[in-house]
């Protein structure tokens, strides 16, 4: 015999109190698959969390973080504070980037400046806590009689900070 509950679609639950009739999920609850015997309570985005997607009868609410914070953990289970550019968030709070490192975002960790000499280039613009160095032409290109060159783009694309 087929389980009568298997006919209950997403957004409903199989109500044992009503002869296994498929009943709609009550307000603030959902069922994302068919054949469920209960509906799950919708997630509430409160405090530092804000609603990115409202709960429906078939899917849970989705939260993100209010300005000044960013998501951490599966499904944005936690909010982590933003820091300023030129800083990184450690377990003990926002700390300035050490000399020779930079962070051009409000999240992530400080990364070392590009070593221009590894690509045989010179430093065109010095790095700061907020910006990577800009590599210029190689020293050989700057020797007398060399044709003028347009400084190339930075030696590498900025990496993506860990999320």
């Amino acid at each position: 015999l087929q389980d009568p509950c298997s006919n209950c679609p997403a957004g409903t639950f199989c109500d044992n109190n009503r002869n296994q009739i498929c009943s709609p999920c009550p307000p603030n609850s959902f069922s994302s698959a068919g054949g469920q015997r209960t509906c799950d309570i919708c997630r509430q985005c409160k405090g530092v969390f804000r609603t990115r997607k409202e709960c429906s009868s078939t899917s849970n609410a989705e939260c993100d973080c209010t300005p000044g914070f960013h998501c951490l953990g599966a499904g944005c289970s936690m909010c982590e504070q933003d820091c300023k550019q030129g800083q990184e968030l450690t377990k003990k709070g926002c700390k300035d980037c050490c000399f020779g490192t930079f962070n051009d975002q409000k999240r992530g960790i400080c990364r070392p400046w590009t070593n221009c000499s590894l690509d045989g280039k010179s430093v065109l613009v010095n790095g700061t806590k907020e910006r990577d160095v800009v590599c210029g032409p190689s020293p050989a290109d700057l020797s007398p009689g060399a044709s003028s060159v347009t400084p190339p783009a930075p030696a590498r694309e900025p990496g993506h900070s860990p999320q």
Partner: nanobody, 124 residues
């Protein structure tokens, strides 16, 4: 699959105590440092405490030093947080986290797996 499951949260009066547990599975527990973090209502994540894989080194946030004690039982794959002299400002969801190595790092990015959290409410 790596899993962390916290328990032991609840409602407690100021000055009271609670012991949180975190049951770990899916990895060699003793090989990894572990941490506790918390998120208070309307606030961001705050690191609370960390412990090395062997249990020989422990670290605490200034806000909990002298009141909270982190420990682990590697034979039971379980992490603990003993919380004494609880204050209203300790109210939060507490999360345990696995670190990427046997020693604890300086960053949240050093933690690669988080539990779902257990709620601690300190109120009279």
């Amino acid at each position: 699959e790596v899993q962390l499951l916290e328990s032991g949260g609840g409602l407690v009066q100021p000055g009271g105590s609670l012991r949180l547990s975190c049951a770990a599975s899916g990895f060699t527990f003793s090989s990894y440092a572990m941490s506790w973090g918390r998120q208070a209502p309307g606030k961001g994540l705050e690191w609370v405490s960390s412990i090395s894989g062997s249990g020989g080194s422990t670290y605490y946030a200034d806000s909990v030093k002298g009141r909270f004690t982190i420990s682990r039982d590697n034979s039971k794959n379980t992490l603990y947080l003993q919380m004494n002299s609880l204050r209203a400002e300790d109210t939060a969801v507490y999360y345990c986290a696995k670190e990427k190595t046997g020693t604890t790092g300086d960053y949240y990015y050093d933690m690669d797996v988080w539990g779902q959290g257990t709620t601690v409410t300190v109120s009279s």
